[in-house]
Amino acid sequence: MAVTACQGLGFVVSLIGIAGIIAATCMDQWSTQDLYNNPVTAVFNYQGLWRSCVRESSGFTECRGYFTLLGLPAMLQAVRALMIVGIVLGAIGLLVSIFALKCIRIGSMEDSAKANMTLTSGIMFIVSGLCAIAGVSVFANMLVTNFWMSTANMYTGMGGMVQTVQTRYTFGAALFVGWVAGGLTLIGGVMMCIACRGLAPEETNYKAVSYHASGHSVAYKPGGFKASTGFGSNTKNKKIYDGGARTEDEVQSYPSKHDYV
């Protein structure tokens, strides 16, 4: 039961995490205008991975896509790539893990195959989560660097009475969504890997016991499941005799636009 719960929970946590990674990737608020220096601005700027937006105090919001590929900073391209890789790996992981779930019976799929698939999906979730966390962290680092650069340049080069306040950007909501989502996907992946260990049938090495019946010399070897060595299904290991000693899990498995800062 504990293994099924761990696997199920790992799947759900990963599902939420990947949904969060997708949401973060699509969100426009990766960086938002820092209002500390100009809290009275009537125009609010924010930027995403795919477009930049301006919300006027009237409520009117205008967004412009980054219609150039070569003109964008390499770091932004890298973040996009990391997030997309994270989504793709996560999606494949989800697909694999659905078939690996113990509560879902597909044909005569053996536990060893399910364990194999659970481990595969778990690794995919871990890599997916790491990609998202890395992508968000790279973007955050880029923001911090640009923030201090623009702070240093804020009032330089302007003589006289005129002030030119350079727009500075700080962390947007998408960064926090991305970090949390990446973390959840990572945790879900770890849980899947832990569940995989419980799913893999263990080698049961029973000692051969010789029973000497009067007049006969018969050696009876209890076999139970002749366990395969791990994750590949071994077709030679036929079920000879069900020894009755099963885990709770086995009993419970029923069928069921531009400038970029």
């Epitope: 601005t41 009537a42 125009v43 700027n45 301006v54 006027e56 409520g59 002030q163 727009t167």
Partner: antibody
Framework: QVQLVQSGAEVKKPGASVKLSCKAS????????MHWVRQRPGQGLEWIGM????????NYNEKFKSKATLTVDKSTSTAYMELSSLRSEDTAVYYC????????????WGQGTTVTVSS | DIQMTQSPSSLSASVGDRVTMTCKSS????????????LTWYQQKPGKAPKLLIY???TRESGVPSRFSGSGSGTDFTLTISSLQPEDFATYYC?????????FGGGTKLEIK
């Protein structure tokens, strides 16, 4: 068509209060910010503040924060501005103006209400 | 608060003339996010409410004749009337639309010569 009809002229004594109204028609009242602007005799325009009828959220010019109170009545599509502790320098024409959607600028203005403060 | 300074304060011209008036702001009204200048021009005739002419420094409001044009960026802006018509004699105000409180210039009064 869009119309903003303001209440009639008011004559008040110093220290009194006055509540000006601006009735909107011809558009969805709750979708646009309503601005209030003051113009003293022979002077320029001064922005008092604005209110969003849907949320009741306001933004005041610091200069008028203790002078003006902006409110709305969604049921009658009417915006109000109450001016308190009136003084002779509050004698002016007060305009309400609808927020322009697509730009920050108001695009429809009321005809104005003249407030005279005299002892 | 952003200070808006208009010049000249009054201007005499004849019908058919090309007229230019300027507006200076104490801070840049250029928004880096969309490269738009948040400056608006209004026309006001005696006893009437102001009328929106131009927003975003150069975008003409619908229904405004093409003889009115706005230009400039950052802190320096210009309103040009290419060929004055009798109905254009009025007071023109520029307004900061970038930062609260929204501030107006002192106005330029356009009179008949």
């Amino acid at each position: 068509q869009v119309q903003l009809v303001q209440s009639g002229a008011e004559v008040k004594k110093p220290g009194a209060s006055v509540k000006l109204s601006c009735k909107a028609s011809g558009y969805t009242f709750t979708s646009y910010w309503m601005h209030w602007v003051r113009q003293r005799p022979g002077q320029g325009l001064e922005w008092i503040g604005m209110i969003h009828p849907n949320s009741g959220s306001t933004n005041y010019n610091e200069k008028f924060k203790s002078k003006a109170t902006l409110t709305v009545d969604k049921s009658t599509s009417t915006a109000y501005m109450e001016l308190s502790s009136l003084r002779s320098e509050d004698t002016a024409v007060y305009y309400c103006a609808r927020r322009y959607y697509g730009s920050i600028s108001p695009d429809y203005w009321g005809q104005g209400t003249t407030v005279t403060v005299s002892s | 608060d952003i200070q808006m300074t208009q010049s000249p304060s009054s201007l005499s011209a004849s019908v058919g003339d090309r007229v230019t008036m300027t507006c200076k702001s104490s801070q840049s009204l250029l928004n880096s996010g969309n490269q738009k200048n948040y400056l608006t021009w209004y026309q006001q005739k005696p006893g009437k409410a102001p009328k929106l002419l131009i927003y975003w420094a150069s975008t003409r409001e619908s229904g405004v004749p093409s003889r009115f044009s706005g230009s400039g960026s950052g802190t320096d802006f210009t309103l040009t009337i290419s060929s004055l018509q009798p109905e254009d004699f009025a007071t023109y105000y520029c307004q900061n639309d970038y930062s609260y409180p929204f501030t107006f210039g002192g106005g330029t009064k356009l009179e008949i010569k």
